[in-house]
């Protein structure tokens, strides 16, 4: 029967006893930077071209015995997971291997850099179709390695990397921490995070998604027909590289931003048991397990959005945190979150010609996160409208006044240390969807966008009694672009989007009296693009 | 994911050297920074990636590398240029004593220097 990992990434529509996806990724070339490989293994013979690139350090230890099958083990298995005939994800993809890891699986940042440069030069000399680069390796945080990945990604190459096997924050490792790279954590057959000895998969905001990474059957370098099970975030990354190859083969014009959004969109949601992660990392770690799209075409009509968390601001009084979208994405809303509840809100501001989301810590706060909602919205023209604190009892209001502009998100930012001592604002009057309302002592920022066929609506869910969490979700066919809380009182820890659901978190109910102050309303802004839907129908 | 310029949990040293008559001060008075791996066992001291400013041409990279070698030699240090980068990032990979970092950071066009470190199969 089909191995569990191939079954897991296959949408129900294709499921039978077989793993037979619609297209094998034949238009895509996948570069593998790893150990040497056994290229005559029956899984990959004729599919993997071994380049003459080699940049590896000497093996440690004077008595190290170099055994070919051991030297090739890691790379052979991964090549098989990506494109192997029996157990591969993208059975049609061709691969090129570069040796940057020695027989002990060790390499250097500099060797990896030279390997990435080699790929770029090859791309310039002989441009082919879409390129995917698989980096099943990790080292400590490296500014230069991340910068090289950024440059290669901006040259149109899709980079996929292992999150790391250190049971730690992936942001502490490279290339996992590079924003332009698709960073993959590992899950097992029970959709649980993979444990590897005393360690396990990395986690946190630098992980884009998870994929099967435990007990993965693949080519073994022991012999030309041998197979073996291996585990790790490398195996998980290889699955995503294979899925990416299949998506790009079906739609070769996809940009990195579009590909990442699709990977996130088609993932299985909320199946991972988050209790495995450290408590402070749970909210930051995406609960997504990669899967192939149910069909190769027809996703273009959707408005795709993802949530991007900033690094933690740190505890100093004036500390801020910034969340950024990718170059091809639009920042449609901005929110903030603080575990202590001490924050001074958030605002959208221009930085280098692009909007960013900045969150502000408050005196005595342990720090804040900025949360950006980043969307693919072609031909969009977005701007931020700000209303200063109103000082009036009705609270501060701001709306999108330009013709054809719709409200995609609301943010509020205040200078006072604690809004909780002040009377909360009244709720926004009904029938005014293009308006943000906030506390009278806060400045309010409305994200207003014009894009062909873009329509948005506001959805609220209020709970009169205090609750730790209030959620509101957008219905089928609509995409969550904005998530905020009414009122902006001190017991609200913040708001953030999880997939298509707006989550507003409050302080533990036991510490909050059941007063009117306890009422919390989650406000979601849900949008869709009629223009994208029409364009998709015309294609079909 | 991590901001490109966010020096997250890593050691960043802005080393200012004494006036070195032979080295041109970096443009705009900016100080190049030194970075190394936060995980000590993974560090590879003695090999450094010298990253130059974005628009630096290959010829300037080669010139900067040669200048570093010449200035190091005057101080009695041997250096070896292992690779000159171009295509992705401008810069070069150099094998040298850590004693020369202050000197290297003052070279023209230098944006930052990173000590080499290990990466591992996952």
């Amino acid at each position: 029967s089909i191995p569990w990992n191939l079954e897991r990434i296959t949408p129900p529509r294709y499921r039978a006893d077989e793993y037979q996806p619609p297209d094998g990724g034949s238009l895509v070339e996948v570069y593998l930077l790893d150990t040497s490989i056994q290229s005559d293994h029956r899984e990959i013979e004729g599919r993997v071209m071994v380049t003459d690139f080699e940049n590896v350090p000497e093996e440690d230890g004077t008595r190290f015995h170099r055994q070919a099958s051991k030297c090739d083990s890691h790379g052979t298995h991964l090549a098989g997971v990506v494109s192997g005939r029996d157990a591969g994800v993208a059975k049609g993809a061709s691969m090129r291997s570069l040796r940057v890891l020695n027989c002990q699986g060790k390499g250097t940042v500099s060797g990896t850099l030279i390997g990435l440069e080699f790929i770029r030069k090859s791309q310039l000399v002989q441009p082919v179709g879409p390129l995917v680069v698989l980096l099943p390796l990790a080292g400590g945080y490296s500014r230069v390695l991340n910068a090289a990945c950024q440059r290669l990604a901006r040259a149109g190459v899709v980079l996929v990397t292992a999150a790391g096997n250190f049971r730690d924050d992936a942001c502490l490792y490279s290339p996992a921490s590079a924003p332009e790279v698709i960073t993959v954590g590992a899950t097992n057959a029970q959709d649980q995070p993979v444990t590897l000895g005393t360690l396990g998969t990395n986690f946190g905001r630098c992980v884009d998604l998870f994929a099967p990474g435990e007990d993965i059957i693949g080519a073994s370098s022991d012999c030309s027909t041998c197979f073996v099970s291996q585990s790790g975030t490398s195996q998980a990354a290889a699955h995503v590289a294979g899925i990416a190859a299949m998506m790009l083969s079906a739609e070769p014009e996809l940009t990195l931003a579009e590909l990442r959004q699709r990977l996130i969109h088609f993932s299985a949601k909320d199946v991972i048991n988050e209790a495995w992660f450290p408590e402070d990392q749970r909210v930051l770690t995406p609960n997504l397990v990669a899967a192939l799209p149910p069909s190769t075409h027809g996703a273009g009509w959707q408005l795709f959005c993802r949530t991007v968390w900033s690094a933690h601001s740190g505890p100093t009084r004036m500390a801020t945190a910034v969340a950024r979208c990718a170059p091809d994405e639009e920042l449609l809303s901005c929110s903030s979150f603080s575990r202590s509840g001490k924050r001074r809100g958030e605002r959208m501001e221009a930085q280098g010609g692009k909007l960013v989301c900045r969150a502000h810590n408050a005196f005595g706060g342990e720090g804040v996160y900025a949360i950006a909602r980043c969307c693919l919205l072609p031909q969009a023209n977005c701007s931020v409208h700000t209303a200063p604190p109103a000082e009036a009892s009705m609270g501060t209001r701001v709306h999108c006044h330009q013709q054809g502009h719709v409200l995609t998100g609301c943010s509020s930012h205040w200078e006072v240390e604690d809004l909780g001592t002040h009377k909360p604002p009244v709720l926004r009057p009904r029938g005014q969807p293009n308006q943000c309302v906030g506390h009278r002592e806060a400045s309010i920022h409305a994200s207003c966008c014009h894009a062909p066929g873009l329509e948005c609506k506001v959805k609220e869910h209020g709970i009169p009694a205090p609750q730790e969490q209030v959620t509101v979700a957008c219905e089928e066919g609509w995409t969550l672009t904005g998530c905020s809380a009414l009122p902006g009182t001190s017991h609200v820890l913040g708001a953030y989007a999880v997939d298509n659901t707006c989550v507003v978190r409050s302080r533990d109910v036991s510490t909050t009296g059941s007063t009117s102050e306890g009422a919390v309303t989650a406000v979601a802004i849900c949008c869709r693009s009629r223009h994208l839907a029409q364009a998709s129908q015309e294609l079909q | 994911q991590e901001d490109e310029d966010g020096d997250y949990e890593e050691l960043v040293l802005a080393l200012r050297s004494e006036e070195d008559g032979l080295a041109e001060a970096p443009e705009h008075g900016t100080t190049a920074t030194f970075h190394r791996c936060a995980k000590d066992p993974w560090r590879l001291p003695g090999t450094y990636v010298v990253v130059l400013k974005e628009e630096t041409h290959l010829s300037q990279s080669e010139r900067t590398a040669r200048r570093l070698q010449a200035q190091a030699a005057r101080r009695g240090y041997l250096t070896k240029i292992l690779h000159v980068f171009h295509g992705l990032l401008p810069g070069f990979l150099v094998k040298m004593s850590g004693d020369l970092l202050e000197l290297a950071l003052k070279l023209p066009h230098v944006d930052y220097i990173e000590e080499d470190s290990s990466v591992f199969a996952q």
């Epitope: 029967s1 793993y19 005939r85 059975k91 049609g92 370098s221 030309s224 027909t225 041998c226 073996v228 | -």
Partner: antibody, heavy 119, light 113 residues
Amino acid sequence: QVQLVQSGAEVKKPGESLKISCKGSGYSFTNYWISWVRQMPGKGLEWMGIIYPGDSYTNYSPSFQGQVTISADKSISTAYLQWSSLKASDTAMYYCARDYFYKPLFDIWGQGTLVTVSS
Amino acid sequence: DIVMTQSPDSLAVSLGERATINCRSSQSVLYSSNNKNYLAWYQQKPGQPPKLLIYWASTRESGVPDRFSGSGSGTDFTLTISSLQAEDVAVYYCQQYSSFPITFGQGTKVEIK
């Protein structure tokens, strides 16, 4: 159910060409390797070669390399074994067999095609 | 190529008695990464194609009676029929599948004494 159905017996003269077939059904033909195995009269089993129908990748036993050609047409779920010039020593029963998943051992066999080469 | 040698060439055993067939490979078919022996056993009755009995040297294929068992490791392997039945009269082949070309033993003919 899963099965491999081979073409019927052939009687040929030396020097003639021949192409015998093996049609798979009840499973995803492109995803499983097909081997050809020869059994000469009263003798044992000899592996000739293998094909992966998904991309028509082949691997031959050195003893049969250049003597036969293995091919496949995935659109009709059929594998082929062909000779350009038969010899009397090619007289044998030829079996096609399907690989077990990721193990080159054979769980499903065709019924066999008897090829007789005689002048 | 890995050469597979079976012994004996033929074997006559009384009904209900144990039949033992040996197979030796010219090089080890045991691999360390998954600690498996890449060896299979087949049964071929007259006028029929072969049938898979055992793989990984000792794993019985589903539907195969438990009187058939395989053992051994590295280069030396054994197929045992614990209590011979009339329907077990056949030729038995060992096969290595660790590398191309795949090779079979010459076969052992099992008859009733």
